[in-house]
Interface confidence: medium
């Protein structure tokens, strides 16, 4: 395209999520208490009032962040929300302060830690969910790092986080069965979902695997896993926790 | 959706319409029978109260979204680092009171996995009931359109969004305009197909106008948030 006047990026032009990176690459901004809203009877198709989630207006090279809502006369500074409810922005005081810490904006429903995070199995203490699987042990028993699974790449390769090596490793297919798959899915957050578990050829070039120690008895799956530099089946576990990403068009194609 | 076309039944089975007081306000994407991904700016106060919201799945026409077919929302979780001024970290989760029944018209989209490489001009799709022209009305029918990912470096150039795009955002559309998401599409999906599987790459967030030249759509970069999403699901279990 002729529009591409910029030089190519120095590092490959890819969008990639590098595992457990911090979600917000910028320092947390002070929390702003939103302005007060007055709810009027809903109209079906009123003008889009208010666009109280502002949009960014760009003018030449000086971007301006609009702070006013998009009124019916309308600045172009809007989020893509159809606030079709006639909620009118009224007088509001902007109280800026660290009192409303960002972490308080969401609540967790845990067993003993309903409002304050995830419970450590060993001590019953609660840790902030953002510290789970972050490479640093916060639970006395380190289980916030031991119970870490993820699916990697478009083939859903199951990887387990090793807090010893501080890195992710694919799980070897040797001795794997669907019960372990169910447990891994549960640990990822898929409560009652499990779709399929199969071995696929590992094309990632891994030289270190997590393998099941079948003689470990009836213990937690994570206690059965150990490091191995070899995987005799030459296959790693591909785990689907939910039958996702299929629409009528693609299911018709595959028939 | 500007420059799109009406969707066929089952083409975007993860798309939901999120209503407040019987009016479509935002879109969302089904990721499990209980969880919907949407935009954080959709649920800013006072709309952070789950009681306000009803989700409709599998229905392509707004007129047919009657009360009994909706799913009530039990919990709204906005990203803790969402910034309403800059729209950084514009993602939220809704947990439904009762799980969706999956069928041919109601299915989840896949969350992207780490290690998924997307090309700079990867073909994607956007969908929603948003306006079909700038300052237009909510659409009666679900629309969808093809868009291309736009490199962050290019989207951050002086002539586009001049460094307003953070790593938690992703641009998609066409620099010449004509095709874009618009008001009412917020929270809805930006998806791409890889290995014959549809992946949720973005949630509709913001843009300057709709379908304007050099003002493509900006979406929450779901890849950055998958860990956060799983943690919320895990904590809830």
């Amino acid at each position: 395209m002729a529009l591409n006047s910029g030089s190519p990026p120095a590092i490959g032009p890819y969008y990639e999520n590098h595992g457990y990176q911090p979600e917000n690459p910028y320092p947390a901004q002070p929390t702003v208490v939103p302005t007060v809203y007055e709810v009027h009877p809903a109209q079906y198709y009123p003008s889009p009032v208010p666009q109280y989630a502002p949009r960014v207006l760009t003018q030449a090279s000086n971007p301006v962040v609009c702070t006013q809502p998009k009124s019916p006369s309308g600045t172009v500074c809007t989020s893509k929300t159809k606030k079709a409810l006639c909620i009118t922005l009224t007088l509001g005081t902007f109280l800026v302060g660290a009192a409303l810490a960002a972490g308080l904006l969401w609540k967790f429903m845990g067993s003993k830690c309903s409002n304050s995070g995830i419970e450590c199995d060993s001590s019953g203490t609660c840790i902030n969910p953002s510290n789970w699987c972050d490479g640093v042990s916060h639970c006395p028993g380190g289980e916030d790092e031991n119970r870490c699974v993820r699916l990697y790449g478009p083939n859903f390769i199951l990887q387990v986080y090793s807090s010893q090596r501080k890195s992710w490793h694919p799980v070897c297919q040797d001795d794997w069965n669907e019960n372990y798959g169910r447990a891994a899915c549960r640990d990822m957050g898929y409560k009652n979902n499990f779709y399929s578990s199969q071995g696929i050829v590992d094309d990632s070039g891994s030289t270190s695997f997590m393998k099941l120690n079948t003689s470990a008895g009836n213990v937690d799956i994570y206690k059965k896993l150990y490091h191995s530099d070899a995987c005799s089946s030459k296959a790693v576990v591909s785990l689907r926790c939910i039958a996702c990403g299929v629409n009528l068009n693609s299911s018709r194609q595959s028939r | 959706i500007v420059g799109g076309e009406s969707a066929l039944p089952g083409a975007w089975p993860w798309q939901v319409s999120l209503h407040v007081q019987n009016v479509h306000v935002c879109g969302g994407s089904i990721i499990t029978p209980e969880w919907i991904v949407t935009a954080a700016h959709c649920v800013e106060k006072p709309l952070n109260n789950p009681a306000h919201w009803t989700a409709f799945a599998g229905i392509l026409r707004q007129s047919f979204m009657f009360y009994g077919a909706g799913y009530q929302v039990e919990k709204v979780i906005s990203h803790p680092n969402y910034d309403s001024k800059t729209k950084n970290n514009d993602i939220a989760l809704m947990k439904l009171q009762k799980p969706l029944t999956f069928n041919d018209l109601v299915k989840p989209v896949c969350l992207p996995n780490p290690g998924m490489m997307l090309q700079p001009e990867q073909l994607c799709w956007i969908s929603g009931w948003g306006a079909t022209e700038e300052k237009g009305k909510t659409s009666e029918v679900l629309n969808a359109a093809k868009v291309l990912l736009i490199e962050t470096q290019r989207c951050n150039s002086r002539y586009v969004y001049d460094n307003l795009i953070t790593p938690a955002m992703i641009c998609a559309g066409f620099l010449q305009g004509n095709v874009d998401s618009c008001q009412g599409d917020s929270g809805g999906p930006l998806v791409t197909s890889k290995n014959n599987i549809w992946w949720l790459i973005g949630d509709t967030s913001w843009g300057s106008g709709c379908a304007k030249a050099y003002r493509p759509g900006v979406y929450g970069n779901v890849m950055v948030f998958t860990d956060w999403i799983y943690r919320q699901m895990r904590a809830d279990g």
């Epitope: - | 009406s6 089952g10 007129s63 047919f64 041919d104 018209l105 109601v106 079909t132 029918v141």
Partner: antibody, heavy 121, light 111 residues
Framework: QVQLQQSGPALVKPGASLKISCEAS????????INWVKQRPGQGLEWIGW????????YYNEKFKGKATLTIDKSSSTAYMLLSSLTSEDSAVYFC??????????????WGTGTTVTVSS | DIVLTQSPASLAVSLGQRATISCRAS??????????MHWYQQKPGQPPKLLIY???NLESGVPARFSGSGSGTDFTLNIHPVEEEDAATYYC?????????FGAGTKLELK
Amino acid sequence: QVQLQQSGPALVKPGASLKISCEASGYTFTYYSINWVKQRPGQGLEWIGWIFPGSGSTYYNEKFKGKATLTIDKSSSTAYMLLSSLTSEDSAVYFCARSDYGSAYGYFDVWGTGTTVTVSS
Amino acid sequence: DIVLTQSPASLAVSLGQRATISCRASKSVSTSGYSYMHWYQQKPGQPPKLLIYLASNLESGVPARFSGSGSGTDFTLNIHPVEEEDAATYYCQHSRDLPLTFGAGTKLELK
């Protein structure tokens, strides 16, 4: 070919209930809604409601709430309508009809054969 | 509820001539580029048969002598040239919102 086969005619007493069936064949049952339509002798058509077999979700015309109950059996690709507390006003031909659900264009492209219901003491 | 008024209630047309049936809605049934009006034909002892959907689209297998037009509140079904087998009752039906409703019907007879 695509067909909707309905149960045969029925003669029932006032106050009784009746379950009418509509068996679908020739297409994927879960992709479409089944609608029910009433036609009194020499009269026009009245839409009763629909059921979507994919999820079992229903919608009733306000006028028929409490009178008709729609159900499905996915295993046999059959839709049912239960009519309760029958009166002479319920004497009619009842049709099942298919419509696409998701796009909800709301037209009926395939119709059942019709079931004649006579309510008489 | 949207009320559909069909006119005339009945009409008699000679073979080969044009039959025009009108359907008026109590409020607009058009939105987002679609007109949610459909037409059916019903013969005695038979179920209705879809002829036209979304105001002007001919259902597959229906002869091209049937055509539909209109938008907003006023819609028309045209049959030209009328053939003997077209003697029937014709119904319009909207699906703009719920409940779905039908017109009272127009009976077409041949002269």
